[in-house]
């Protein structure tokens, strides 16, 4: 499919001008290659009319130009003094006319309306309001006032001062007679339809002395604004419908076959399933405007979108609307990254988030999409030290591996963590990507004690058991804080005995804290990584208390200091449901009751072989 995009249809009137914008992927080659505008012949060729290399056909001499905007990835063709002869099929493109890097454009130039003398022209957008003013003389002040519409050869009564309203206008028309001082009446038509366009006649009086005034009403269908976005990127539609619809339900819909427009999202709570997890509708201040953000763009998202306002929350005749034509460029600069990441209850996930590598200094963010109301995405963590309170100790945003990717690690997973998350930066807003976390059956691979108490001034050793599947990975311990996880020295204690059916390649790696101080209290993570790519992690909260008796503490998984109501598994490991808690010192009081939805036998699942867009919690 050609990545060139422009308007499918351009309509104008004789004598007027048009400006046609064509979009292309702004690669280095594309920015500098030839741009052209050509007319398609009956036999399939395409005759160049104007190009960026200076050529201008004699047909366009003195009335057209082509300007390239390489920084935007667009070029613009302006054509003036249009005639009906300019109607036809054209292409805007890059390179050689026959190469296929082009977009088809239909140009329709119509004859201007033949208007009677003294005709007032009203040009109004679809769905809006028009006021037709009708002057009259004093002698007709007391006489009947009326508005007719010319249908074919005959005038048809639309409204009059005796109370008649044509059924086609019921509920959306009124006739106002100004105060005695002004010799004027006006007809106000709301929620204008395309069928309202045409020639009108207002009249005061019915005899030969009546006053008449011609009016021509043109109802404009909104020209779609062209929007060109990258596959996997995001788009924002800004919809400004005016203060008169500030309190009316708003919607965004996508046109399907014919005149149907399927609701994508509306303020009444409707949202199309295909947009679950990747759309926000944001009401704006005062004026009834709103914006809709869609992330994780797919090729099937391309098409014509309309936003509007109607009490039903969907497109109806007479809704004021705005239109966009969205083109999704499949030659995307946004790299593929997994759209689904799987983890097990009690385990962890490491999510890779792409960003524009030119913006390495930008602030990185991760938020949780919530579908309630119109959708919102509260921030969970950023690269400047913000961590949402409920996530302290189990969530970290790391700048690694860098060069266009950052990492978010979330551990102590529960079923409540399943959902959609957005990766964002404060640089190029189009780089918002969506990832879904799924909680699947299985057990965490890394095994650590549930909670640990250290004694001031003593030495503490905390074990982390790594199964043999991680034999080739780097193993580490780190201390969590709100800006990351600071690496700590650890000791390899040899093979672990914590795993059934696991050979000498399993490992027990311990963290040792010498001469414990109050500053050592907090969350510690053990984990695996390969270079700058992070895999699974497990978290332990270390509380610090006053010395009771001398000696050092060596914490094992099957330590007998389990709380009385903790469940000890057959294999001798304490199983703790790692709830995110606001005061980790309450951790010992937490009842470790297994959530049957979250805990299951069997090992972790990894990448689904059926999808290159999914990743397991520890794979990359």
């Amino acid at each position: 499919k050609s990545p060139i995009f422009g308007p499918e249809e351009v309509n104008s009137v004789e004598g007027n001008s048009v400006s046609i914008t064509c979009y292309y992927p702004p690669t280095s080659v594309n920015r500098h290659t030839r741009k052209y505008w050509c007319r398609q012949g009956a036999r399939g060729g395409c005759i160049t009319l104007i190009s960026s290399e200076g050529y201008v056909s004699s047909k366009y001499a003195g009335r057209a130009n082509l300007t390239n905007f390489p920084e935007n990835g667009t070029f613009v063709v302006n054509i003036a003094q249009l005639s009906q002869d300019d109607s036809g099929r054209y292409k805007c493109g890059l390179g050689i006319n026959s190469r296929g890097l082009s977009f088809d454009v239909s140009l329709e130039v119509s004859q201007g309306p033949g208007l009677l003398n003294d005709t007032k022209v009203y040009t109004v957008d679809l769905g809006r309001t028009v006021t037709i003013n009708c002057p009259f003389k004093t002698e007709n002040a007391q006489k009947r006032k009326s508005l007719y519409k010319q249908i074919g050869l005959y005038p048809v009564l639309v409204i009059d001062s005796s109370g008649y309203v044509n059924p086609n206008y019921t509920g959306r028309i009124r006739l106002d007679i100004q105060g005695t001082g002004q010799l004027l009446f006006s007809v106000v038509i709301n929620q204008l339809r395309l069928s309202d366009a045409g020639q009108y006649l207002c009249q005061a009086g019915d005899d030969s002395n009546s006053n008449k005034k011609n009016a021509d009403l043109q109802v404009l269908k909104p020209e779609p604004e062209l929007v060109y976005e990258d596959l996997r990127g995001s788009v924002t539609f800004h919809c400004a419908l005016g203060p008169e619809v500030a309190n009316v339900a708003k919607f965004l819909c996508r046109q399907s076959s014919g005149e149907n427009c399927d609701v994508v999202v509306n303020t009444l709570g409707k949202r199309a399933p295909a947009f679950e997890g990747r759309i926000l509708l944001n009401p704006q201040d005062k004026d009834g405007s709103f914006s809709v953000v869609i992330t994780g763009l797919r090729k099937e998202d391309a098409g014509r979108y309309l936003c509007g306002a109607h009490s039903d929350g969907q497109l109806q005749e007479g809704s004021p609307i705005q239109a966009w034509q969205l083109f999704v460029n499949e030659e995307s600069t946004i790299p593929r990254s997994p759209t689904v990441v799987k983890g097990v209850a009690g385990g962890s996930v490491a999510v890779l988030c792409p960003y524009n590598r030119k913006e390495s200094k930008s602030i990185k963010y991760w938020c949780l999409w919530e579908g309630a109301q119109n959708g919102r995405c509260p921030l969970l963590v950023d690269s400047e030290g913000w961590v949402k309170a409920q996530y302290e100790g189990r969530l970290s945003l790391l700048e690694e591996p860098g060069n266009g990717t950052f990492t978010v690690i979330l551990n102590q997973l529960t079923s409540r963590d399943a959902g959609f998350y957005w990766c964002l930066t404060n640089g190029d807003t189009l780089w918002r990507t969506t990832v879904e976390i799924k909680i699947i059956e299985g057990e965490p691979n890394l095994k650590v004690p549930g909670n640990v108490t250290a004694v001031l001034g003593e030495t503490l050793k905390v074990p982390c058991h790594f199964p043999c599947k991680f034999s080739s990975y780097e193993k580490y311990w780190c201390k969590w804080n709100n800006t990351g996880c600071q690496a700590l020295p650890s000791q390899d204690e040899g093979p672990s005995k914590a795993f059934v059916n696991c050979d000498e390649n399993s490992r027990l790696v311990s963290l040792t804290l010498n001469l414990v101080t109050r500053a050592d209290e907090g969350w510690y993570w053990c984990g695996v990584k390969q270079g700058h790519f992070y895999g699974e992690t497990a978290a332990v909260y270390v509380a610090v208390e006053e010395r009771k008796a001398a000696g050092s503490r060596d914490v094992s998984l099957a330590k007998a200091d389990a709380a009385p109501d903790e469940k000890v598994l057959d294999s001798g490991f304490r199983e703790i449901e790692n709830k995110a808690i606001q005061d980790p010192r309450l951790f010992a009081e937490e009842k470790a009751v297994a959530d049957t939805r979250d805990q299951a036998d069997g090992s972790r699942a990894s990448v689904d072989s059926g999808s290159s867009e999914e990743q397991g919690g520890s794979s990359r």
Epitope: P378, L379, W386, K388
Partner: nanobody, 126 residues
Framework: EVQLVESGGGLVQAGGSLRLSCAAS?????MGWFRQAPGKEREFAAA????????YYADAVKGRFTISRDNAKNTVYLQMNSLKPEDTAVYYC??????????????????????WGQGTLVTVSS
């Protein structure tokens, strides 16, 4: 639930300065100042992110007003210099504890701020 209490408003002569403070009962990712002049709609004045690295200003106050925050005290400030009679308004402090402004790019949008103070009156006489 975040409670916000503004202070620092008062009467000042044109060209003078005032410093508004807003004390919050808990931490918030984004904090903002909005104002409402008599007979007018409430409008955005300034906003600041958690770290203070991102600040936003309405065109009408750019270069004259400075927003800052002290996270240790959960307080946000609005330093207003070169005040004009048209700055006369009730100034409201607003908080977005969840940081929803980031994904929506709604830093200037009152809908994004879930918590509001009672307001403090600033009167600039000519």
């Amino acid at each position: 639930e975040v409670q916000l209490v503004e202070s620092g408003g008062g009467l000042v002569q044109a060209g003078g300065s005032l410093r508004l403070s807003c004390a919050a009962s808990g931490r918030s990712y984004a904090m903002g100042w909005f104002r409402q002049a008599p007979g007018k709609e409430r409008e955005f004045a300034a906003a600041i992110s958690w770290s203070g690295s991102r600040t936003y200003y309405a065109d009408a106050v750019k270069g004259r007003f400075t927003i800052s925050r002290d996270n240790a005290k959960n307080t946000v400030y609005l330093q207003m210099n070169s005040l004009k009679p048209e700055d006369t308004a009730v100034y409201y402090c607003a908080a977005d504890p969840d940081g929803t402004v980031v994904a929506s790019s709604g830093w200037t949008n009152s809908y994004e701020y879930g918590y509001w103070g009672q307001g403090t009156l600033v009167t600039v006489s000519s």
